[in-house]
Every structure is written in structure tokens, then in C-alpha cells.
Interface confidence: low
């Protein structure tokens, strides 16, 4: 059974109860490369941030290159998506309880800024996959995800005909594509410049207030 985010009283500055997350957010000076924007306040450790940049990292044994080499232009979005998932302390309003062996909580319908989704989709045009939902249905017999029998490798566009199909379908509706733009304070940015602070803090505050939770 699932209960809504409203069942949590701590929606701001929180870490999800999942496989690699810290129990509480805090500074992490040595966050690696694409995860570095979260240095000042993170739910991930430096070693998690280092590991998630690797192809088929030990975090989940997930292989981005399951249909041949994923273009770097595309892969950087999946790395950024993983940084957001592992490191962000600002996704409390969208945490849901789940009954899974590897995690007790997940995100649902995080309002991703429309430009971040559009860019992700465009940048992955030249890469290939064999599935439209990457949460389930893989062949894990080798210990690493492989395309299931009968699943053909095609361009991303074949499996994700629109930006929303990618961002919403990929991880079982962890994201929903917002109508709001980057910088609006009403949608979560996957990419941001930490020199200006973390724009997602304001977004979390807005949605937490809208849920009538302090």
C-alpha cells in the first residue's frame, strides 16, 4: 500500500529512506563532478556521487549501454538524474512510501522543469534502448540489466515519442513534466548552478505550503 506525502510531517530538507541515501542531509565537500551542485547540502555521500558516474556502477548494477554505447550527450542527463535522485534534500513533498525490497520510499510526480525534460529528450535522440520503462522488466540473470527476450533496440524516439513519454514513463512517473519554466520557483531543476544557491529549496517550500504542512 502507498500513502501520500502528506503522511510525512517533514517535507523540507529531508532524505528519502532508500538504498544509498543518508538519514539526514548535510554538507558534502567532495561530491563528484555532476553531483557537485549539491555540495552545500546533500543526501548522498562523496563515494555514492563518485560511483554513480561510472558505467554499470555498483550502486544498482544498471548498464546505460544496454543497446550499444550511449552518447555522452545523452548519458550526462542520466547521471544528472541520478545525482538529483541520490543527493537532493528538496524532494520531500513528492516522497511516497513503497513496499520494495531495496527501498521503503520513492519519489512520485516530481514537477520537472519543462526545459530540462525537453533537453534530455533531444540529447538522447541518437542513443538506443529497448524499453520504455526502466524500472521493471529487465533480464537480470547476468547480474546486470539486459534487454528482455523480444525487446528490440531502437532509437529513444521509438520508445519515447515525446519529452513527456521519456521523463514520465522512464522511472514509472517519478517525474511529471511541469508547465513551468526553469527559474520560476515552481518546478524542480535537474541542472542548476550552485553559485546562486539551490533553486529547488524554494520549489519544495512552495509545494510543502500548498500541501498545508509546515
Amino acid at each position: 500500500t502507498m500513502c501520500s506525502a502528506q503522511d510525512r510531517t517533514d517535507l523540507l530538507n529531508v532524505c528519502m529512506d532508500a538504498k544509498h541515501h543518508k538519514t539526514k542531509p548535510g554538507p558534502e565537500d567532495k561530491l563528484h563532478d555532476q553531483c557537485s551542485p549539491w555540495k552545500k547540502n546533500a543526501c548522498c555521500t562523496a563515494s555514492t556521487s563518485q560511483e554513480l558516474h561510472k558505467d554499470t556502477s555498483r550502486l544498482y548494477n544498471f548498464n546505460w549501454d544496454h543497446c550499444g554505447k550511449m552518447e555522452p550527450a545523452c548519458k550526462r542527463h542520466f547521471i544528472q538524474d541520478t545525482c538529483l535522485y541520490e543527493c537532493s534534500p528538496n524532494l520531500g513533498p513528492w516522497i511516497q512510501q513503497v513496499n520494495q525490497s531495496w527501498r521503503k520510499e520513492r519519489f512520485l510526480d516530481v514537477p520537472l522543469c519543462k526545459e530540462d525534460c525537453q533537453r534530455w529528450w533531444e540529447d538522447c535522440h541518437t542513443s538506443h534502448t529497448c524499453k520504455s520503462n526502466w524500472h521493471r522488466g529487465w533480464d537480470w540473470t547476468s547480474g546486470v540489466n539486459k534487454c528482455p527476450a523480444g525487446a528490440l533496440c531502437r532509437t529513444f524516439e521509438s520508445y519515447f515519442p515525446t519529452p513527456a513519454a521519456l521523463c514520465e514513463g522512464l522511472w514509472s512517473h517519478s517525474y511529471k513534466v511541469s508547465n513551468y519554466s526553469r527559474g520560476s520557483g515552481r518546478c524542480i531543476q535537474m541542472w542548476f548552478d550552485s553559485a546562486q544557491g539551490n533553486p529547488n529549496e524554494e520549489v519544495a517550500r512552495f509545494y510543502a505550503a500548498a500541501m498545508h504542512v509546515n
Epitope: R119, E122, D123, H125, T126, E157, F192
Partner: antibody, heavy 117, light 107 residues
Framework: QVQLKESGPGLVQPSQTLSLTCTVS????????VSWVRQPPGKGLEWMGA???????DYNSALKSRLSISKDTSKSQVFLKMNSLQTEDTAIYFC???????????WGQGVMVTVSS | DIQMTQSPASLSASLEEIVTITCQAS??????LAWYQQKPGKSPQLLIY???RLADGVPSRFSGSRSGTQYSLKISRLQVEDIGDYYC?????????FGGGTKLELK
């Protein structure tokens, strides 16, 4: 090996229409986006517009009213049409393949177009 | 449109010298910035993307950095083959816009 090659007339009369073709090889237009960039003699670069893999287009607003980009994926060709040419449209016209949605990773050799009577 | 202000417009440097070119964006573009090199009579070539990442085959003497909305391209030890024009380009939004260019010459 990725290659792009522009072709078209070297000289166009003022007020006439420019038609250029970009023929590509080493990649497919069904899964790659291509744009046009121009460079007036001795000057900088100007992005003109793009055609995305799905067929939709984006144009530089300064040129939008007289520019059209299309493609024939079966022939691996991208076309640029621009009407009402003036002398300030004299430039080298490049077609480029995107690195993702963001940068220009591969460039054609360019074609010099002079607008003059 | 996002304006990219590049400086200097031209630059004379000696072999093995350190060269720095900068680009100022008129608004926040995150890390969506590329640098290109254009040799005389040739097409531009992608050198650096995402502000700091080296494109394939580019020598390690080239590097990119960022401070807020200011971006820099550094050549650590100038070589003869580095002579040419350099352009920055923002990839944050359409229209994609370029800096005015920097002409790099040998002293």
C-alpha cells in the same frame, strides 16, 4: 565517418531566393538534428535554424519570416530556403550536426554565397 | 536573445605562453557553453562543451572554466597549430548565440 557537405549557387541576385542542400553521410537524419550556421566574410558566426530528428524546426527570430528548413531523410539531405536576399546575406553557409540539442559537433566545409547584381 | 560578449577581440602571444580568452553571458546559462576553434579557411571545430569538458581528440593544453556568468578558455602552452579564431557559444536556449570571436596571432 560523419560527413556533411553543402551545395548551392555561389551567386544570387538581390531579392531572389537562396536554395542550399546539405548532404550527410555516416549518420541518419531520422535520429539526428541538423542546423544551419552562417558567417559573413571576416565576421562571426550566426545560428540560423535547425531541423530536429522528428522533423520539427526552430528558427532564429531575426530570419524566421524568410527562412525555411526541411529534409528528405531517404536521401540524407537537409534543405535551406531563404527568400528576399540582400547584400548583407553574403556569407559562408555551414550545415552542422548537433552534439545532442546543444552544441555543434560536426561541420560541413561551408559554401560561399555572394548576393550581388 | 542571450548576448555573449567575448574578449579580447584580438590577441598576440608567443609560443609556449599561457593564453586566456573570456566570454560573458548576458544571463544565467548554467554550464551550457562551448568553445570552438576556426583555422583560416576552415570550418569551426568543437573544442570544449559543458563549459569544462574537452571534446574528443582535443589536446589537454586546452581547458575551460566558469565563474558565474563568465567563462574562460585557457591554452596552457601556445603551439603554432593553435593560431586561428576562437568563438564561445551558449547552448541554454534558442537562438543559439555566439561570441564575437577572438583572433589569436603569434607574436
Amino acid at each position: 565517418q560523419v560527413q556533411l557537405k553543402e551545395s548551392g549557387p555561389g551567386l544570387v541576385q538581390p531579392s531572389q531566393t537562396l536554395s542550399l542542400t546539405c548532404t550527410v553521410s555516416g549518420f541518419s537524419l531520422t535520429s539526428n538534428s541538423v542546423s544551419w550556421v552562417r558567417q559573413p566574410p571576416g565576421k562571426g558566426l550566426e545560428w540560423m535554424g535547425a531541423i530536429w530528428s522528428g522533423g520539427s524546426t526552430d528558427y532564429n527570430s531575426a530570419l524566421k519570416s524568410r527562412l525555411s528548413i526541411s529534409k528528405d531523410t531517404s536521401k540524407s539531405q537537409v534543405f535551406l530556403k531563404m527568400n528576399s536576399l540582400q547584400t548583407e546575406d553574403t556569407a559562408i553557409y555551414f550545415c552542422t550536426r548537433y552534439y545532442g540539442y546543444t552544441y555543434f559537433a560536426y561541420w560541413g566545409q561551408g559554401v560561399m554565397v555572394t548576393v550581388s547584381s | 536573445d542571450i548576448q555573449m560578449t567575448q574578449s579580447p577581440a584580438s590577441l598576440s602571444a608567443s609560443l609556449e605562453e599561457i593564453v586566456t580568452i573570456t566570454c560573458q553571458a548576458s544571463q544565467d546559462i548554467g554550464n551550457w557553453l562551448a568553445w570552438y576553434q576556426q583555422k583560416p579557411g576552415k570550418s569551426p571545430q568543437l573544442l570544449i562543451y559543458d563549459a569544462i569538458r574537452l571534446a574528443d581528440g582535443v589536446p589537454s593544453r586546452f581547458s575551460g572554466s566558469r565563474s558565474g556568468t563568465q567563462y574562460s578558455l585557457k591554452i596552457s602552452r601556445l603551439q603554432v597549430e593553435d593560431i586561428g579564431d576562437y568563438y564561445c557559444q551558449q547552448g541554454q536556449s534558442n537562438p543559439r548565440t555566439f561570441g564575437g570571436g577572438t583572433k589569436l596571432e603569434l607574436k
